[in-house]
Structure formats: structure tokens, C-alpha cells
């Protein structure tokens, strides 16, 4: 069984799912209202939002007194994070602004990838080996929407039987979706492109928020239980709570490698030839060089135009 | 447009009970928390009580914690507010208030009240 | 809880720009609320996280918070902006709002 790194609001904290009964190790502490938190495994990298400070911030996991602002302008309620660990980009949702944003790791390079029909985005899910992102939007007109990681071929996917969809996760190994709808109360699953959708859990949990998975087992956090959860994957079965009385439970992954598997990155050779960003993309060749937002790519569909 | 109507108020003795109703419109109830704040003559604004969208959590105010009870009939777009105990120091105006979406992280305000309902603890 | 202190009372004349105080021990640690309310009248909010007007609520009304105070400043006061204004935060925890004691602005 994995760890899992959840947000707390006021830390960022470490437990063990096999002895989830044992306190949580403090891997960042005093924080205003840290929300959403991703990692790059092989970068010894965590990442984090604060919704208070309206910020995105890092620290090594080795070094953890070491805290370095990474996003810092232009952020109102960064809710959502997503951290490509091929590419070596920065993915956020922002649901105040209505934004979906990328940069590199640093936070350099920024570039809004979708600005319209956003409400309330919130979760968001990366696929870099395949070049799609995945993000739910629980707004007035409630959905989880797919697009390639370079902000083209943007779909709606699920669009009914949802109202607070919140946690979403992705299974490379089955190639599935997961998400938890606060509202209604249940997990579901589907095909990648929203086919195929069945319950995972049946309405009866109080108000799951973020979710992920590590090998046959879903684990969530549950803002009305102030606890983790857990249960089968694919039957819904053993549910039972795994972590408890934690102070403001926010998003959760299981800090493995595993779940940041290694492919080809086709910019890993002299950026794919990108003078800036080089975005994964779900068609051939699977990357996108893009510009920094305000910068025009020149016709080469390589270069940003001078001043970037 | 959003209303919240108070009703309930009215002379109790001390010691005595009272129970509070605020009628909601035009938002989804069940998607809101909502509260009770309160305002003594001449005094400044007191919180007393909230509930969650689903009414599964609820918080009190320690000065009245163990004689007021909230509860909320999402099927009726009903808010209440049960009194016991009252005390002389409990007279004030109670307002209900909406607070913040159920499925938002970081925001507790009140943006819409209601009028109020006097609530006046004598002998 | 954060304990919030407000001036009594603040004056102003009119086409003036009015700034009420609401200080607590390290309140840019929170977001902080404002609300007006005018006689026999229920509170109507009109600053949001620090310094975020809601809808229908004049551009006159702006909002700051740092160090051990929140500002709320109304510029070009006018005669209907006489009121009582009430600083407000929470804690991250629980809903629990915290009140300042209540500023009156008298617009003279």
C-alpha cells in the first residue's frame, strides 16, 4: 500500500494507507489554506495551492524547510493541480479567474490554455503519455471535460447524472476515469472519453472531495467525515475509513512513482525544437510547441515572437 | 431573486422556549450553508448558529451552545432555530443568513439576510 | 479566535474619502468581510475576501488587508453611505463568524 500526500488547509501531511490509525508525518507545515497538491516524483518535487494566499508554491521532499513561491500573480482560487511529470509542466485550475493555466515547473513560461465556458473548475487530472488533460467543472451547468494538454481538442465527456463533481483520477493501467460527486453522493467510472459509465460506490457518502488510486484501491478525502476512505476499485466493496480526524481534508495522491510511470517524451530532445513551451498533445507528433500568453508563435510553429 | 423570511419571534419568559423559522426562495436551498446572527438593541452583530448544506454539521456559538438547537427541511426551504433556556440576554433580533456554497473551500460570508425577527426575554 | 477592534465611531464630509480600521493580531492571515447596515435595516455585504465588491455595490467601496489591519475605504462618501459597517472573518475550520464590535459613519 502506498502513502498518501493530502492537503490539510493548514499543512501538507504524509500517512501510510496500510496504518492509517498512525498520526500523519507534517511534510510542510504552517500554511494558510493549502488546497490542492500534486508531486514530481523523480524530481523529489511537491507542489501546492493556497487558496488564501492565492498562490502555488514547492518545496524538495527531502528538504522541506526549503519553500519556494512558484505562481504568485494573477491567482484567485487556484482549486485545482496538476503536476506533468513527462513534459515538466505546471497544470492549475483557477475557479474564480475561470481559467486553466500551464507553466514550466518553475512557474515560467505561463500560458492560459482555456478561458471560456468555465464556471467552477476544480479537479484536474493529467495523461501525459497519451497528451490529455482531464478537469470537472461543478458550475451551473456541472460537467468533467477532456483536451489535449496543448489546449486543443477540448470535449465535454460526462455532462448528466453529475452535480458536484470534485475528485477525478485516472487509471493508466485500465485506461479509466474515477470521480467522486460531493452532491450526489457516489464514485463513478468510465472510459477515458466518458463511455461506458458505471457506479463504483452508490450514493452514500457524505461529501467526498478529492480522490486518487493506487493498484486495485480508490482512496478519498470526505469533508463531512473529516477522514480518508477506501475501498475496491472495481466493486466498490471494503469501503471503510482508513484516516481520521483530520482537521480540513483537501486533496489527496498516492506519493508513488508508480503513479507517474516513464514513457517517451517527444520534447525530451532539445525541447522538440520549441523556443518556449513544449506542450504534450494527443496527435501526431504528440507535442505542441506553444508561447507564453500575449506571445504569437511564428508560422514555423516553433519560435515565439521576440519580446517573450 | 434570493429572500429570507424570519418568523417566530415574539415575548417568551426566561426559561422558556421559542422556536424560529426562516422561509427561503429563489436559490437552491440544499446547496447552502445557512445561520442565525443576531443583534441585541443598540449592540453589534453575534453569530449563533449554522448548518451545513445537508444539515449533517452543524455549529453553535458557546453562548448558546447546549439550549439552541439548528436544523434545517431542505424539502421546505426551511430554516429553525429551537430555543430553550432562554435567558434576558438572549433578547435581540435574529437574522437568518445564507452562507457559503456547500461545495466551496475557503469562502464564509453571509451575503444575503433576511429581515430579522425580534426576540424579546422578560418577565 | 481572532479578536476584531473597530472604531467606534468615524466621520466624514461628503465627496470625502471615509477609511474604517477593523485590527486583530495577524488578521492578513484571514479574509476579511464588510458589511453595512443602516437603521432598522439587516446587514448588506459589501466587501468580500479583503478587498472583492459583490455585485451591485458601488466601485466608491474598496477593500485592503495587511499586516494587523483591514481597511475598508469609501471614496467620494455619500450621504446615503451613513451606516454602521462591521468587519467580519472566520476561521478556516468552521463557519463560526467573528464580528468587530461596529463602526458609525456619519457623513457630515
Known amino acids: 500500500a502506498p502513502l498518501l500526500l493530502y492537503a490539510n488547509r493548514r499543512d501538507l501531511r504524509l500517512v501510510d494507507a496500510t496504518n492509517g490509525k498512525e498520526n500523519a508525518t507534517i511534510v510542510v507545515g504552517g500554511l494558510e489554506d493549502a488546497a490542492a497538491v500534486d508531486f514530481v516524483f523523480s524530481h523529489g518535487l511537491i507542489y501546492w495551492s493556497d487558496v488564501s494566499e492565492e498562490a502555488i508554491k514547492r518545496t524538495e521532499f527531502n528538504k522541506t524547510e526549503s519553500v519556494q513561491n512558484v505562481v504568485v500573480s494573477g491567482l484567485l482560487s487556484p482549486d485545482g493541480l496538476a503536476c506533468d511529470w513527462l513534459g515538466e509542466k505546471l497544470y492549475w485550475t483557477d475557479s474564480e479567474t475561470n481559467r486553466i493555466e500551464v507553466s514550466n515547473l518553475d512557474g515560467s513560461l505561463r500560458k492560459v490554455l482555456f478561458w471560456q465556458e468555465l464556471d467552477q473548475p476544480r479537479a484536474i487530472a493529467l495523461d501525459p503519455s497519451s497528451g490529455f488533460m482531464y478537469w470537472t467543472d461543478w458550475g451551473e451547468v456541472p460537467k468533467i471535460e477532456r483536451a489535449g494538454m496543448d489546449g486543443s481538442s477540448r470535449f465535454i465527456i460526462i455532462n448528466s447524472e453529475i452535480y458536484w463533481p470534485n475528485g477525478l483520477t485516472l487509471d493508466y493501467e485500465e485506461q479509466k476515469l474515477y470521480w467522486a460527486d460531493a452532491k450526489l453522493n457516489f464514485i463513478h467510472k468510465s472510459n477515458l472519453d466518458g463511455t461506458n459509465r458505471q457506479a463504483v460506490v452508490k450514493g452514500s457518502l457524505p461529501h467526498p472531495f478529492a480522490l486518487t488510486l493506487f493498484e486495485d484501491i480508490l482512496y478519498w478525502t470526505d469533508w463531512s467525515t473529516h477522514s480518508i476512505l477506501a475501498c475496491n476499485k472495481y466493486t466498490g466493496e471494503g469501503l471503510r475509513e482508513i484516516h481520521s480526524d483530520i482537521f480540513s481534508p483537501m486533496d489527496i495522491h498516492a506519493f508513488s512513482q508508480q503513479r507517474q510511470p516513464n514513457a517517451t517524451n517527444p520534447c525530451g530532445i532539445d525541447n522538440g525544437g520549441c523556443s518556449h513551451l513544449c506542450l504534450m498533445s494527443p496527435v501526431k507528433p504528440f507535442y505542441q510547441c506553444a508561447c507564453p500568453t500575449g506571445v504569437k508563435l511564428l508560422e514555423n510553429g516553433k519560435t515565439c515572437k521576440d519580446g517573450a | 431573486q434570493v429572500q429570507l423570511v424570519e418568523s417566530g419571534g415574539g415575548l417568551v419568559q426566561p426559561g422558556g422556549s421559542l422556536r424560529l423559522s426562516c422561509a427561503a426562495s429563489?436559490?437552491?436551498?440544499?446547496?447552502?450553508?445557512i445561520h442565525w446572527v443576531r443583534q441585541a438593541p443598540g449592540k453589534g452583530l453575534e453569530w449563533v448558529s449554522g448548518?451545513?448544506?445537508?444539515?449533517?454539521?452543524?455549529h453553535y456559538a458557546d453562548s448558546v451552545k447546549g439550549r439552541f438547537t439548528i436544523s434545517r427541511d431542505n424539502s421546505k426551504n426551511t430554516l429553525y432555530l429551537q430555543m430553550n433556556s432562554l435567558r434576558a440576554e438572549d433578547t435581540a433580533v435574529y437574522y437568518c443568513?445564507?452562507?457559503?456554497?456547500?461545495?466551496?473551500?475557503?469562502?464564509?460570508?453571509?451575503?444575503?439576510w433576511g429581515q430579522g425577527t425580534l426576540v424579546t426575554v422578560s418577565s | 479566535d481572532i479578536e476584531l477592534t473597530q472604531p467606534p465611531s468615524v466621520s466624514v464630509a461628503p465627496g470625502q474619502t471615509a477609511r474604517i480600521s477593523c485590527s486583530g493580531d495577524?488578521?492578513?492571515?484571514?479574509?476579511v468581510y464588510w458589511y453595512q447596515q443602516k437603521p432598522g435595516q439587516a446587514p448588506v455585504l459589501v466587501i468580500y475576501?479583503?478587498?472583492k465588491r459583490p455585485s451591485g455595490i458601488p466601485e466608491r467601496f474598496s477593500g485592503s488587508n495587511s499586516g494587523n489591519t483591514a481597511t475598508l475605504t469609501i471614496s467620494g462618501t455619500q450621504a446615503e453611505d451613513e451606516a454602521d459597517y462591521y468587519c467580519?472573518?472566520?476561521?478556516?475550520?468552521?463557519?463560526?463568524?467573528?464580528f468587530g464590535g461596529g463602526t458609525k459613519l456619519t457623513v457630515l
Open positions: 443568513a445564507r452562507g457559503s456554497h456547500g461545495n466551496i473551500m475557503a469562502k464564509r460570508y453571509f451575503d444575503f
Open positions: 429563489g436559490f437552491t436551498f440544499s446547496d447552502y450553508a
Open positions: 448548518i451545513s448544506y445537508s444539515g449533517s454539521s452543524t
Open positions: 495577524n488578521i492578513r492571515k484571514k479574509y
Open positions: 475576501e479583503d478587498s
Open positions: 467580519s472573518t472566520a476561521d478556516s475550520g468552521i463557519n463560526n463568524g467573528v
